[in-house]
C-alpha cells in the first residue's frame, strides 16, 4: 500500500496591491494535484506580523486571501495542502508547509517618522488628522498623506493640508463615502533633501473614533415636588439617537456634584424643596452599539435656574 | 475573452538589448503566472522565463539566467522581457503565454520576431 | 534537466482515423505533461494538461494518458483540421522543456 502523500502549494507569496496595508495572500496549486481530481483540496494558511505572539488561521479551498496588516512591521506567512480524510481512505494528509515573509525596506531612521498622530471623526462627518514632525528633522522635510478603504480603485493623497511654517502638519479629508465599519488605511511619508524620511503606517475604523457635537436645547421640567427631569436634544448631523451615551454634571447649589451616565436624554434628579439653584452640563459619545470605542465631546453650554421658580411647573431656559 | 499582445519585437545586433511587451486582458492579470517561450527557426519551442502573478517568483534556464528579465505591472495587465547580451541562438518568434493553474500554459499570444544579427 | 523526447518527428494519417503521438521523459514527471497543438502559421494552443485533462472547448477526440516517464496524445476519427504539429511539455519542474514536435500529415 503506498503512502499518499501530496506537495505543498507553489509560488506562494505576498503581494501589496498599493492599498497601504491591505495585502493579498496568493498560491498556486500544488503539482501531481489532479491525482485528487475527485477530492477537494484545502489549504490551511497562517500568517500574521511579525513580532505579534499568535497567528490567524485559516482554512480555505480558494487560491487567495485578503486581509490587514501593519506594515510598520515585516508579515509572515505560511501554508500547506490539506487533503481530507475521504480522500486518503484514512486520516488528513499534509503537505509540507511553504513560507513566504514580505516587508517594506524602511527608509530613514525611526525618529524621523511623524509624531502624534492623531485622528479624530468629527460628528461622523468630517475626518481630520494631525501630526508632529520628525525628532530633528529640518523645514525642509514636508510629509504628505495617503489612505485608502475598500470601495477607493486606488490610494488617495490628502488634497487639503493643514500647514505650520511651510510644513503638512495634518489632513482635513474630503467626504468619505461608505468609509465606515471597514479599515481605514494610511500612509504618511515624507520627503527631505537632507536625508530619508521613514513612512509610517495606521489602521482604524472611522466609527471608533467619532467625536460629537454636544447636546443641545437642554431643558428641566418639575416632575414633582421632588424630582425634576432634565431634557436635551441629539447633536444635530447624522449619528442617530439609538448611538448615543450621555455624561452628565448636575451641581445644586453651588455644592452637591452629581455625575451620571445615561443612554437617553432624560436624567430624572430627585431634589429638595430648598434647592435655590441647579445646573448641568452634558456630553456626548458614541455608544457600544454603534462602535468599540469613540470620544466624548465637547461639554454642552451650561443650563441654570435659580430662584423660587424651582419648585413650580415647567423650567425653560 | 483571454487576449494575450505581444510587442517590441525586431533586428538587433549581437550583444544588443531589446525589451519585449505583452499586453493582457480577459482574465484578472495579478492571479496568474505568466511565460515567455520562444519558438526558433528550427521551430523548436524553448521556454525562456516564468514570473508568478504577484511577481515574487521569477524563474529562468540557465540559458538566458543573468541576460534576461522578466517583469510584470499588475496595474496595467502588462508583461515585460528584458533581454540583453542578445547573441545569435536567441533569433526566433517569442510567444507570451498565462500558466493556467497546473502550471501549464493555457492560453498564448500571437508572437513578436526577434532577430538577432550584425 | 529533463529531456522530453518525441521520437517520431513525422506522421501520416487519414481523415477517420487513430493516430497516437507518443512523448517520453527522461525522468519521472508524475503526471505534470501537457500537449499543444500549432496550426501552420499560427501560435500553439492548449489541448491537454496533467496528462489526461483536456481544455475546455477542446474536442473529445482528443485523448491524453500516460504518467512518470511515457505519455500519448490519441487522435480519434482524425479531421482534416487536424493537421498540425503537436508538442508535448514537462512542468513537474524547472527547466521546463519541450519535446521536439510531431508533425502530422494527413493523406
Known amino acids: 500500500d503506498t503512502e499518499i502523500k501530496v506537495n505543498p502549494p507553489q509560488d506562494f507569496e505576498i503581494v501589496d496591491p498599493g492599498y497601504l496595508g491591505y495585502l493579498y495572500l496568493q498560491w498556486q496549486p500544488p503539482l501531481s494535484l489532479d491525482h485528487f481530481k475527485e477530492c477537494t483540496v484545502e489549504y490551511e494558511l497562517k500568517y500574521r506580523n511579525i513580532g505579534s505572539e499568535t497567528w490567524k488561521t485559516i482554512i480555505t479551498k480558494n487560491l487567495h486571501y485578503k486581509d490587514g496588516f501593519d506594515l510598520n512591521k515585516g508579515i509572515e506567512a505560511k501554508i500547506h495542502t490539506l487533503l481530507p480524510w475521504q480522500c486518503t481512505n484514512g486520516s488528513e494528509v499534509q503537505s509540507s508547509w511553504a513560507e513566504t515573509t514580505y516587508w517594506i525596506s524602511p527608509q530613514g531612521i525611526p525618529e524621523t517618522k511623524v509624531q502624534d498622530m492623531d485622528c479624530v471623526y468629527y460628528n461622523w462627518q468630517y475626518l481630520l488628522c494631525s501630526w508632529k514632525p520628525g525628532i530633528g528633522v529640518l523645514l525642509d522635510t514636508n510629509y504628505n498623506l495617503f489612505y485608502w478603504y475598500e470601495g477607493l480603485d486606488h490610494a488617495l493623497q490628502c488634497v487639503d493640508y493643514i500647514k505650520a511654517d511651510g510644513q503638512n502638519i495634518g489632513c482635513r479629508f474630503p467626504y468619505l463615502e461608505a468609509s465606515d465599519y471597514k479599515d481605514f488605511y494610511i500612509c504618511v511619508n515624507g520627503s527631505s533633501e537632507n536625508k530619508p524620511i521613514r513612512s509610517s503606517y495606521f489602521t482604524f475604523q472611522l466609527q471608533n473614533i467619532v467625536k460629537p457635537l454636544p447636546p443641545v436645547y437642554l431643558t428641566f421640567t418639575r416632575e414633582s415636588s421632588c424630582e425634576i427631569k432634565l431634557k436635551w436634544s441629539i447633536p444635530l448631523g447624522p449619528i442617530p439617537a439609538r448611538c448615543f451615551d450621555y455624561e452628565i454634571e448636575i451641581r445644586e447649589d453651588d455644592t452637591t456634584l452629581v455625575t451620571a451616565t445615561v443612554e437617553n436624554e432624560t436624567y430624572t434628579l430627585k431634589t429638595t424643596n430648598e434647592t435655590r439653584q441647579l445646573c448641568f452640563v452634558v456630553r456626548s459619545k458614541v455608544n457600544i452599539y454603534c462602535s468599540d470605542d469613540g470620544i466624548w465631546s465637547e461639554w454642552s453650554d451650561k443650563q441654570c435656574w435659580e430662584g423660587e421658580d424651582l419648585s413650580k411647573k415647567t423650567l425653560l431656559r | 475573452e483571454v487576449k494575450l499582445v505581444e510587442s517590441g519585437g525586431g533586428l538587433v545586433k549581437p550583444g544588443g538589448s531589446l525589451k519585449l511587451s505583452c499586453a493582457a486582458s480577459?482574465?484578472?492579470?495579478?492571479?496568474?503566472?505568466m511565460s515567455w517561450v520562444r519558438q526558433t527557426p528550427e521551430k523548436r519551442l524553448e521556454w525562456v522565463a516564468t514570473?508568478?502573478?504577484?511577481?515574487?517568483?521569477?524563474y529562468y534556464p540557465d540559458s538566458v539566467k543573468g541576460r534576461f528579465t522578466i517583469s510584470r505591472d499588475n496595474a496595467k495587465n502588462n508583461l515585460y522581457l528584458q533581454m540583453s547580451s542578445l547573441r545569435s541562438e536567441d533569433t526566433a518568434l517569442y510567444y507570451c503565454?498565462?500558466?493556467?493553474?497546473?502550471?501549464?500554459?493555457?492560453?498564448w499570444g500571437q508572437g513578436t520576431s526577434v532577430t538577432v544579427s550584425s | 534537466d529533463i529531456v522530453m523526447t518525441q521520437s517520431q518527428k513525422f506522421m501520416s494519417t487519414s481523415v477517420g482515423d487513430r493516430v497516437s503521438v507518443t512523448c517520453r521523459a527522461s525522468?519521472?514527471?508524475?503526471?505534470?505533461v501537457a500537449w499543444y497543438q500549432q496550426k501552420p502559421g499560427q501560435s500553439p494552443k492548449s489541448l491537454i494538461y496533467s496528462a489526461s485533462y483536456r481544455y475546455s472547448g477542446v474536442p473529445d477526440r482528443f485523448t491524453g494518458s500516460g504518467s512518470g516517464t511515457d505519455f500519448t496524445l490519441t487522435i480519434s476519427n482524425v479531421q482534416s483540421e487536424d493537421l498540425a504539429e503537436y508538442f508535448c511539455?514537462?512542468?513537474?519542474?524547472?527547466?521546463?522543456?519541450f519535446g521536439g514536435g510531431t508533425k502530422l500529415e494527413i493523406r
Open positions: 514570473i508568478s502573478g504577484g511577481g515574487s517568483y521569477t
Open positions: 525522468q519521472n514527471v508524475d503526471i505534470n
Open positions: 503565454a498565462r500558466r493556467d493553474l497546473r502550471s501549464a500554459m493555457d492560453h
Open positions: 480577459g482574465f484578472t492579470f495579478s492571479s496568474y503566472g
Open positions: 511539455q514537462q512542468y513537474n519542474s524547472y527547466p521546463l522543456t
